[in-house]
Interface confidence: medium
């Protein structure tokens, strides 16, 4: 049979030829009969045989890594007979391994977020390397991992290659950290190969920062004249943290927000000052305002770097706008007789310059020729005025600033012209009727009734009468109805139209005014020739034709 | 050690001028606002005038206005007070006063320099 | 503008009493501002009081301020020597304008 031991040859030996083993066959006596042949991959260019003694040669530098084992297949033949002497067998030629190959870190670049103030120990990231040596070999491919860069912020586990946070970082200071990770074989004995990688290690950003205002003192200012809502000017303050963390809200501390708010631009992270209630330079010409900012998010765990917000002092300054002179009253009702003399005292308005330079102030009555008014505002009559013409002004007066004519203010002004008696009551029309000549006495011939142009406190009334003469010796009478009408009626029996055809009948009528007017009214009364029907009359100078009153033609 | 020093007072006829000035030294004056305060025997003390710390906005009493000008060296930290059409009631010990920086009250005063306006 | 009444025009103690200062507004301060200033003879004023109750850098203990809207107290606890002196107070919401001022003086 076959005789061998199992062959090992040690990889990356530079020799030209490296004795493995033998192969034998027991029936060899060693006097060169057999011849020993070599088949398979490899045989005659990586092993050769020596074919008398069976001895098996390595010729080539072998690599483990490149192959581990051969399997060769082995003859032996009886040079004399040319016959096998043993069945062709299969053996195995094993590459042993040496420590040629250092350690490899495969999964390169290698690049971890861990989150800022993380407290020792976290974990950020595992690395690990490969060794192309055996590692059932002695020690030749285990390997231990060791910092070469990071100290003392991160530690490498030696056996598992685990980086983890050895002391705590802030990102406001570094905010990226590269981390040099050393991998040895042999355990890190003497003539250990070693392999190094390169690790960025990135801090996320955590709210450990508070907005801090960038000036303990800000100076604003602001026009009486801006409307509410109006921006007045911004405040800005800084947080050393990023993105979201850095969000703020600005806001005024309650004691100071009546007048003005802060309202937050996010995407300036600016504090807009705006004008919350209009200001009055007159009333008050600066304010002081604080104001406070926070973080917009900031979780429970980190409430302890925000414990007190950040403040700064706003001073606004109010620029006085030069306003228009201002009236005491929206409007002036004044009151006055008619028929007082020009010159009358009307009443007084007045304006005054709302601006702390108090400019004189300048009056006018615009498109009046009834009114004067002077510079202190005194109104008077330049007219005199007639109640039964105008009973109302509506008039505009002008305030000007003597400094400055383009600040002008107008009110209305109604003057309300007050009654006096100076008018008579008077027939409410002209009445001209007849009698007839067969008339008896005590016969109702007119209803009169009279106007007064006056205007009366109580109702008018009136009261008739015939004049003195008429009196006397009239042919008629009146009757007063207490009801600011009278009737006239025949006093005797019998008219004569040749003898008198007409009579003029003067009839007193006076006011209730004080003192009482009272005025003259003719009354015109034909004598008619009244036939029985009593339709048509024939009457001196004209015909009277009856119907619904008299028509004269 | 923080100080403000005034000069420039003196007697002055009705209608005439007088400009004084106020050296500040031991702070930084060009951060604060400066103001002219004056003390009379009759109407007690009266601020004159503001002036911000950067010279941008002036404001004024009415008592004065039109008459005083504040204005501000910050380079030779001195603050100035040209006053003119003097008036015999501008007859007072004029003070310069520096402004907290957080409110309009005076925490700085000067030992002032006394104007007196007299025919 | 704002008018300022201080009471009384003199307060006549002696030391290690207790002075109670009266400063009273026209119209309501706002934000209480108002300080109060004592000055010395032929001395400048000195702040002592700010936003109606906060002690200046360096001012003792004993000087103590009140109040808001119109009506302001200064209190000093116990009078000494160097406190015998004219007193201000300041309004500065609304421009700026003074009391005319109590003297404390030694009884």
């Known amino acids: 049979g076959w005789v061998w031991n199992q062959f090992f040859v040690p990889e990356e030996m530079n020799t030209t030829s490296h004795h493995i083993g033998q192969l034998r066959s027991d029936l060899d006596n060693g006097n060169n009969s057999f011849q020993y042949k070599l088949l398979g991959a490899g045989a005659g260019s990586t092993f050769i045989i020596d074919e008398r003694t069976g001895d098996i040669y390595a010729i080539q530098k072998l690599d483990r890594e490149e192959r581990s084992l051969y399997i060769l297949r082995a003859q032996v033949i009886d040079i004399a007979t040319g016959r096998a002497v043993e069945p062709e067998s299969e053996f195995v030629i094993k590459v042993s391994d040496i420590n040629d190959n250092e350690p490899k870190f495969l999964d390169e670049p290698y690049e971890a977020i861990v989150p800022e103030m993380s407290p020792e120990g976290t974990l950020v990231i595992q690395v690990t390397a490969s060794d192309a040596d055996d590692p059932s070999s002695g020690n030749n491919a285990r390997l231990l991992y060791s910092l070469l860069q990071g100290q003392p912020y991160f530690s490498v586990e030696p056996t598992t290659g685990v980086i983890r946070i050895s002391s705590k970082m802030d990102r406001e200071l570094q905010d990226e950290y590269w981390v040099i990770i050393q991998a040895k074989d042999m355990i890190g004995q003497p003539g250990a190969l070693s392999g190094t990688t390169s690790v960025l290690i990135k801090l996320s950003d955590v709210n450990d920062n508070k907005p801090i205002f960038k000036e303990s003192l800000y100076r604003l200012t602001v026009s009486e004249s801006a409307p509410t809502g109006t921006s007045i000017g911004t405040i800005m303050a800084y947080d050393n943290d990023i993105g979201e963390n850095a969000e703020m809200d600005y806001s005024i501390e309650e004691d100071d927000s009546q007048t003005f708010d802060i309202i937050t631009n996010h995407e300036t992270q600016e504090g807009i000052v705006i004008l919350k209630k209009k200001v009055d330079f007159e009333h008050q010409n600066h304010y002081g305002i604080r104001a406070k900012v926070k973080n917009h998010h900031v979780p429970e765990q980190l409430m302890k770097y925000h414990t007190e917000a950040s403040t700064t002092f706003i001073k606004i300054q109010v620029e006085d706008v030069d306003e228009p002179p201002l009236f005491l009253l929206p409007y002036y009702v004044f009151e006055v007789f008619e028929e007082t003399p020009q010159g009358s005292f009307v009443g007084v308005v007045s304006a005054t310059d709302p601006d702390n330079r108090k400019s004189p102030i300048r009056y006018s009555i615009t498109r009046s020729k009834v009114f004067n008014i002077n510079d202190n505002g005194t109104i008077t009559t330049s007219n005199s005025l007639d109640r039964e013409i105008s009973a109302w002004y509506n008039l505009s007066i002008t305030a000007t600033e003597k400094y400055n004519i383009e600040q002008i203010s107008s009110i209305p002004l109604y003057v309300q012209v007050l009654n006096i008696n100076d008018h008579a009551p008077e027939f409410s029309q002209y009445y001209e009727t007849y009698v007839c000549e067969n008339a008896g006495s005590g016969q109702v011939i007119q209803t009169i009734s009279a106007v007064d142009r006056d205007e009366s406190i109580e109702e008018h009334h009136f009261y008739f009468n015939l004049s003195v003469e008429d009196t006397n010796n009239s042919s008629f009478t009146i009757i007063d109805n207490q009801d600011n009408t009278a009737v006239i009626l025949t006093n005797r029996t019998g008219f004569n139209l040749q003898e008198e055809p007409v009579f003029y009948i003067s009839i007193l009528i006076a006011d209730n005014g004080i003192p009482s007017l009272t005025s003259t009214n003719t009354l015109t009364i034909h004598v008619c020739d009244c036939g029985d029907s009593g339709s048509t009359q024939t009457c001196q100078y004209q015909e009277l034709v009856l119907s619904m009153g008299f028509k004269t033609e | 050690q923080v100080q403000l020093v005034e000069s420039g007072g003196g007697v002055v006829q009705p209608g005439g001028s007088l400009r004084l000035s106020c050296a500040a030294s031991?702070?930084?004056?060009?951060?604060?606002?400066m103001d002219w305060v004056r003390q009379t025997p009759g109407k007690g003390l009266e601020w004159v005038a503001v002036?911000?710390?950067?010279?941008?906005?002036?404001y004024y009493a009415d008592s004065v206005r039109g008459r005083f000008t504040i204005s501000r060296d910050n380079s030779k930290n001195t603050l100035f007070l040209q006053m003119n059409s003097l008036r015999v009631e501008d007859t007072a010990v004029y003070y310069c006063?520096?402004?907290?920086?957080?409110?309009?009250?005076?925490?700085?005063w000067g030992r002032g320099t006394l104007v007196t306006v007299s025919s | 503008e704002i008018v300022l009444t201080q009471s009384p025009g003199t307060l006549s103690l002696s030391p290690g009493e207790r002075a109670t200062l009266s400063c009273r507004a026209s119209?309501?301060?706002?934000?209480?501002?108002l300080a109060w200033y004592q000055q010395r003879p032929g001395q400048a004023p000195r702040l002592l009081i700010y936003?109606?109750?906060s002690r200046a850098t360096g001012i003792p203990d004993r000087f103590s301020g009140s109040g808001s809207g119109t009506d302001f107290t200064l209190t000093i606890s116990s009078l000494e020597p160097e406190d015998f002196a004219v007193y201000y107070c300041?309004?500065?919401?609304?421009?700026?304008?003074f009391g005319q001022g109590t003297k404390v003086e030694i009884k």
């Open positions: 006063a520096r402004e907290t920086g957080e409110g309009w009250y005076f925490d700085l």
């Open positions: 031991g702070f930084s004056f060009s951060s604060y606002d």
């Open positions: 300041q309004q500065y919401g609304s421009s700026w304008t």
């Open positions: 936003g109606a109750s």
């Open positions: 002036i911000w710390y950067d010279g941008s906005n002036k």
């Open positions: 119209q309501s301060v706002s934000s209480s501002y």
